[in-house]
Each structure stands twice: as C-alpha cells, then as structure tokens.
C-alpha cells in the first residue's frame, strides 16, 4: 500500500510532490536573509529573527507556530573591559598583547554587535605564569606529558590547539592537570587546507581569524542552573557555585598570528614526536616557560566576561497529523549564531525553512501527513544546546510517550565532497532507500543516485557496496532527544573528503568570516548540495511522518549490537590476567545480543505478514518500533552522567562530539591499569556488563509477541 493511503488524499501528494517543491533558489534567498546581521543568543536581533520565522512559518501554512521562551545562563564579554592575553616582562610590563577583535570581512566593516572572540562561560581572572604547550589537550596528550615526559602542568597556563575533540573536554583535561588558565588557538595544520587561499579570497582561515565556542562540560544537563527541569518563570535556580559544567579557570581563544608570538619563544622540552607539531614556523617546544633569552617573561590572561541569566526563544511549528496526531516526528535545528552564521547554523536553518514551505504548500492543497510533524528553530545551541534541552525538559512526558523520531538540522554543509549521516541503526534502511531514490549532485555522477556517489566516496568499513553511517555523538540539538529521552534520531549534511583534508571541521568555523559569501562563492554557488541535504532531511521526515508502517528496521540494531559487543569484549581481553583473576565473563551480553537478534528477526517476519488494514494491530506494531529506542534508556543514567541515559550510545567522555558504544563498560575499562583499587575497578566492569546485558535483553523482549 502507498504511504498516502491512510490519509485519504490524491496520489499526487506523495514524497515526489514534496521533493519537487524544494528549490535551491529559495534556500539561497533564505540563507541570505538569515545572515546579514549577527544573531547571538539572548540578543534583540535573535528575538526579532524568531518572530520573523514564526510569521513566515504561519504564512507557509503550518497549523500553529508558537514561541517558547526560557531564562537560561548565558555568557558575554564585558563591552568596556575587553579580554586579551599578554606577554609580560620581569617588571610586569605588557610587551605583547593579543588582538581584541577579528578584522571584519569586506562589506561588513560597519556592522555593529559583532561579539569579539571569547570562550563562553570562562570565569573572570588574570592569571599569569609559564606556558606549557599541550598539543590538542586530549586525554592522551596529558598522559604523554605527565606520565612519559614528567611535565607538571600544575600552576601553569596551558596553550592547546583546537581540533580533534570538543573544546570543553580540552578545558576539563587542563583543569584536572592543575592548569590555572587555558589558551586555545587554531593551528594552520588543522584550519588551513594546502593550496587554498584565506578568506575573502578562499575558504581558509586567515591569521586573525578566531574560533568562538562554549567550554562547558554539561553532560546533557541543559541550562546550568536548572538541570533536569525547564528554566521557566517559576524555576528554582542553583547558585553559581552549584551550576552544572562551568569551567573553573580562565580560558580564551586566539588566531594563529597571535599564537605564533606565544609559541615562538617556547623553551623546555622538545615535542615528543611529529604528531605534536603543527604548521607554524615555531619549534613546538612543550615548555614549561620561554627559552633562555626570554625566560623571565611570563604570559598573563585578562578575562572579564560575565555569566547572565537571559531570555531565549525557540520557535515551535506544528503540522497536525491526519491519522495519528499523537505521534510526533520532529525536525529541529538552531537559529542562534556566534556572528553571521553563514554555515553554522543558517545553512541548516535555510533548509528547514524551505522544508516547512514545501510541507505548507502540500497542506494548502488539502494534504496532511499521517503523523504530526513538529518543526523547531532552537535558540542558544551555541551556549550548550540550551533551547532544545529546556523545551524537551518542559515537554518530556509528551515526548517520551509520543516521540517517533527527531531529525537534526544544523549546518547543511561542512564541505562539498559527499554526504555524511549519523543516526540510530533503526534508520539505516530508511536512509539507504531514500538516497537510492535521490539524484547525486556530485560532479562525475550525473544521472547516478546519491546512494551511489555516497557509497563510492565514503564506503562502509564493514559492508562492501554500502555507505558509511556513523554513530551519534553530541555537540548538537539531537542530544536530549536521543541520549536522554531515547527517541530515534538522525542527522545528515554534506561533508569534506576526510582523507585529503585533515583539518578539524571547516576552517572558518565560528569565526566572523562565516558569511553568506563564504557559502555562495566557495562552497555551493548553485546551492545544489543544500538542495540535496534538504531532500535527505525532508525526505526522512516525510517518510517517518507518512509511511503506514514506521520505516525502522530492528534487525540493523541487532547487527550493530553484535559488532559493539565484539569490540568491547576485545578491549577487555587486552587485560587477560585481570580478566582471569576477577572471572570477568561476557556470556550474559553475548547471550542477550543473540536473543535480541532472534527476536528482531521474528518481529520483522511478523511485520511483513500482519494485516495492515487492522488499525489496532498496525498501531501495536508501530508502537513496538517506536518504543524500541526508548527501551535502551536506563532511568538511572550512566555513572556521574545522569542525563546520558542511553546504554548503547553516549557521547565519549573524552570527546563530546564522538559517539561511544556500550559507554558504561567502555568508561569502566578506560585506563583501568592505573586504578588504585583493581578489585573495585573490575567489579565496576562486571556491573556495567550486567547493566548492558540486562538492557539489551529487556529491549529484545519489547519486540516479542505481546501475548
């Protein structure tokens, strides 16, 4: 049966009609409109944009569009007391100061309210001391420094290059190492692709460009003052000393021109190996402190930013479902930007806008989706996923009972090479089937499917003839839906060639140079990649909202569970003596995965055969599919991370952006050889195997015949 049958509409109102209505030229116009001034969270400009989007979504034909506001903790530089870093001589005189702002790009010289580069939520402070270069400030970098090189960061100011891991993890690692300040910088090795010019002549980062960003370690908490609950009018707020995830030492970001001035004087130990060297003409000495001639000079930070409770606004649009209005498919992406948001987030927001317009056009012609579609323009994503998290906290009871799926829509592009998808295994088949029906926008793949170009350019490491689909991590607005609530989630965007471009993210990420012109001149002049991403995101939403049987395949979860069990077992077996001493067995986990595999297979057989004209049975089967992701949620959460409750996936404890499988077991095993009480440590490994095995078994049983 067609996916339209249950909504009793004319056949032309199908997926094809929806996709054909999406236009690259509209996305281009919307992107231009959204990027002419800054839309920093908590500012009047971003409130005005929220009201504009509300108005336009209503015009497009949504049933209702409301603003949902919250009062959350944000962070801003002091306008009259700027942040900067100095080199000071033995008399305390400042002999070098870092720049106070990025040189504005051509055409934007007279724009007001460009927030200068800062690390959001840095505490105030003016620490001074010797510098230690800590590479990317990853866990393994501090292991190398402290354990192998015997370098003590206690009481030092550390300088770390951006890239590889989320900046908040860098700051947390520096704090744990005893540092009293952190300087973050963009090294050309990571943010300057060879053979490409700097902006405005190309898409590379100029020396004065700086990456902004928050440095929180929220672990899914949302607003730091109201963890677990919405920051509404009657909220009880924690004191700032009890706030979740705030850094305790001053932090500030700089560009590579300024970094050169700090790093060129570094003395002390040589870099341990070539992986610690960037592309600047400096020795990359680790320190501590400056070399001979400059040994009496110190580094001093001047940080005066303030944390302020500020009102933010989400825009929530509703397109009511005709048959199952109490089942929600959500498409959400953020609206707030650090400056102009040319890529992040407005390349995503423009795509959402066009998707809403297309759905609205169909609705005006008499069509409705089977299920309700919710559209969201989130605020304050850049300050810790605050808008989406507060809204989900406020609506958690509805979402956990009615949420079918969440599709994220931040930046549509981070390159123009091929598709990149991260999603729950439940969506693998949906993504495969959809991309087989879409045309590839890639040069050399004219007349070929998106699936074909994607598979050729980004092959699966395990399955030949299939594309790579990655695990969901965090660092974006799907976090609360997937990691906390257990709603099946996915994201898609166009990306770079990771093999030839080793830089982290895209070079102009979170800088003033992320403009409309960056996209229109260098990334996607025809907006064909944006259109493709709109087709993927919109197509996923369409199918999730309109197919009679939910397009989830539980057998794909069985496959990955086995893969993840094999992987975590292998990590554990690297400690054979302890495994033997403490009688560590994975029998329960492998047995649970086997049961899940068998039950999922039987469920899939029943799914093919059942009477789809019986609405009660249809609803029952769909509910089993919808609630499968929910079944992987442990109400107690992961150790010390109560808002990360998914037992199969969590953001890595060492990099928020990355996903980790069986995170409870993984974290229990991590660096276990250094634990002071091995018996206790291996006891926790065994407990985590038990939790994982129980959860997989319990999830399997939700797919069994109900009686």
């Amino acid at each position: 049966k067609s996916s339209n049958e249950a909504t009793n509409i004319t056949p032309k109102h199908n997926m094809k009609a929806f996709l054909d209505e999406l236009k690259a030229e509209n996305i281009k116009k919307f992107l231009y409109n959204f990027t002419q001034i800054p839309h920093l969270a908590g500012t009047e400009q971003n409130f005005q944009l929220a009201k504009q989007i509300q108005s336009q979504w209503k015009e497009f034909g949504l049933d209702s569009v409301e603003l949902a506001h919250y009062d959350v903790l944000l962070s801003y530089p002091n306008k009259t007391h700027p942040n900067y870093i100095s080199i000071i001589n033995e008399d305390g005189n400042e002999i070098f100061n870092t720049s106070l702002f990025e040189p504005p790009p051509p055409g934007y010289e007279n724009v007001s309210d460009i927030v200068p580069p800062f690390s959001a939520f840095s505490p105030q402070g003016m620490p001074e001391g010797d510098l230690v270069y800590v590479n990317y400030a990853r866990t393994e970098d501090f292991f190398k420094l402290e354990r192998d090189m015997k370098i003590n960061c206690s009481g030092k100011i550390v300088i770390a290059r951006y890239g590889k891991v989320f900046r908040g993890n860098k700051v947390k690692n520096a704090q744990l190492a005893g540092a009293k300040g952190v300087i973050l910088y963009s090294d050309p090795a990571d943010y300057f692709a060879p053979g490409v010019k700097s902006y405005p002549d190309g898409w590379n980062l100029p020396g004065g460009g700086v990456q902004r960003g928050n440095i929180l370690n929220l672990n899914g908490a949302g607003d730091p003052l109201t963890p677990g609950y919405p920051a509404n009018e009657y909220a009880y707020r924690r004191g700032i000393a009890e706030a979740v995830g705030l850094p305790s030492i001053p932090v500030h970001p700089i560009g590579y021109y300024d970094a050169q001035k700090l790093l060129e004087k570094m003395g002390g130990s040589a870099p341990p190996d070539s992986s610690w060297r960037g592309s600047l003409k400096v020795p990359y000495n680790v320190g501590p402190g400056f070399t001979g001639n400059f040994s009496t000079q110190k580094v001093k930070m001047h940080i005066h930013s303030t944390n302020e409770v500020t009102r933010i606004y989400n825009v929530i649009g509703t397109l009511r479902g005709a048959v199952e209005p109490d089942r929600y498919v959500i498409l959400g992406g953020h609206r707030d930007s650090w400056v102009f948001g040319g890529i992040d987030p407005q390349s995503g927001a423009a795509v959402v806008h066009e998707i809403v317009r297309s759905f609205g056009t169909l609705k005006k012609e008499g069509w409705r989706p089977r299920r309700t579609i919710l559209f969201a323009s989130w605020d304050a994503e850049e300050f810790g996923l605050l808008g989406s998290t507060e809204w989900a906290e406020e609506n958690s009871r509805l979402l956990q009972e009615r949420g079918v799926a969440y599709i994220n829509a931040d930046s549509s592009i981070e390159g123009n090479y091929t598709l990149r998808v991260d999603c729950t295994p439940l969506m693998y088949s949906l993504v495969h089937n959809l991309t087989k029906e879409l045309k590839s926008p890639d040069e050399g793949f004219e007349g070929k499917s998106l699936y074909e170009s994607w598979t050729k350019k980004s092959p699966s490491p395990e399955f030949s003839g299939m594309p790579r689909i990655s695990k969901l991590g965090s660092g974006n607005d799907f976090e609360v839906f997937f990691q906390r609530l257990g709603i099946a989630s996915g994201r898609a965007r166009y990306t770079k060639n990771w093999e030839t471009n080793k830089f982290s993210g895209y070079p102009l990420y979170h800088s003033v140079y992320e403009t409309y012109e960056l996209v229109e001149k260098f990334y996607d002049p025809m907006f064909k990649y944006h259109l493709t991403v709109a087709q993927v995101r919109g197509g996923m939403v369409f199918e999730l909202a309109n197919s009679i049987v939910l397009p989830f395949d539980c057998r794909d979860y069985a496959v990955v569970l086995r893969k993840y069990a094999d992987k975590i077992y292998s990590i554990s077996m690297k400690h054979p003596q302890e495994m033997k001493t403490y009688s560590v067995s994975f029998d329960s986990l492998f047995s649970a995965v086997k049961n899940f595999t068998e039950i999922a297979s039987k469920f899939s057989e029943r799914l093919q055969d059942f009477d789809k004209s019986n609405p009660i049975v249809l609803r029952m089967m769909n509910d089993q599919l919808m609630f499968l992701e929910r079944a992987f949620i442990d109400p107690l959460g992961l150790p010390d991370r109560p808002f990360y409750r998914h037992v199969i996936y969590a953001p890595s404890s060492h990099n928020k952006y990355a996903g980790e499988s069986f995170p409870g077991i993984y974290d229990a095993l991590f660096d276990i050889e250094s634990k002071v009480d091995p018996s206790k440590a291996w006891g926790e490994v065994k407990r985590q195997i038990y939790v994982a095995a129980f959860t997989v078994q319990a999830a399997a049983e939700t797919l069994s015949e109900v009686a």
């Epitope: 094999d566 001493t581 067995s585």
Partner: nanobody, 113 residues
Framework: EVQLVESGGGLVQPGGSLRLSCAAS????????MSWVRQAPGKGLEWVSS????????YYVDSVKGRFTISRDNSKSTLYLQMNSLRAEDTAVYYC??????WGQGTLVTVSS
C-alpha cells in the same frame, strides 16, 4: 561444560609459520567472540588477538599486526591463529580464551634456530 582444546604448537625457525587451532565444545560457539592469549617464559599473560562472530571483526596487539591472522569456522566450532614471519619473541604458551572464565590448557610455540 565448556571445553577449549588447543593444538598446532611446536618448534619452528625464525621466519617460519604455524597454524594453531582451538576446538570448542559445550556452548554455542558462534554466539561468542573468542581470543588468543599468550604467556612467554617468566612473563605475564599477553592478549594477542580477538575475533567477533565473523572474520570482519578482528583485533590484534600491535606486535603481531600483519603477521598473525585470527579466523574461525563456526560450522566446526573451531578458532584458528595463523602465525607467519615468526620471531624469537613470539615464543610462548598460546591459550584459546572465551573470556576471563573459560580458557584452554595452552599449546607451546617455540621459535628458535
């Protein structure tokens, strides 16, 4: 009752090859990942390699990568370790292990000229 029985060890010259086998019984072999662990004379246990349900999921300690290959035949409930370009430092008792609880009795591999 779980039983793991290794075979295939012996004396071999440096650069030579051996293939170890581990016959498993008393459990559904295909359900479980399996490992090889070794113990050199006077040393502690060292993990060598693990394999998931099929040959797509394999893991090796760095020192044997490119020289050793782990494989399994689920229809025969047998685990294998093909060892090529053997070195003196590969001399050890090699154990087949299901996890921390179930191990074989081991088979001795001696690499010597």
């Amino acid at each position: 009752e779980v039983q793991l029985v290794e075979s295939g060890g012996g004396l071999v010259q440096p650069g030579g090859s051996l293939r170890l086998s581990c016959a498993a019984s008393g459990f559904t072999f295909s359900t479980y990942a399996m490992s090889w662990v070794r113990q050199a004379p006077g040393k502690g246990l060292e993990w060598v390699s693990s394999i998931g349900e099929n040959d797509r999921t394999t893991y090796y300690v760095d020192s044997v990568k490119g020289r050793f290959t782990i494989s399994r035949d689920n229809s025969k409930s047998t685990l294998y370790l093909q060892m090529n370009s053997l070195r003196a430092e590969d001399t050890a008792v090699y154990y087949c292990a299901k996890d921390g609880v179930h191990w074989g009795q081991g088979t001795l591999v001696t690499v010597s000229s």
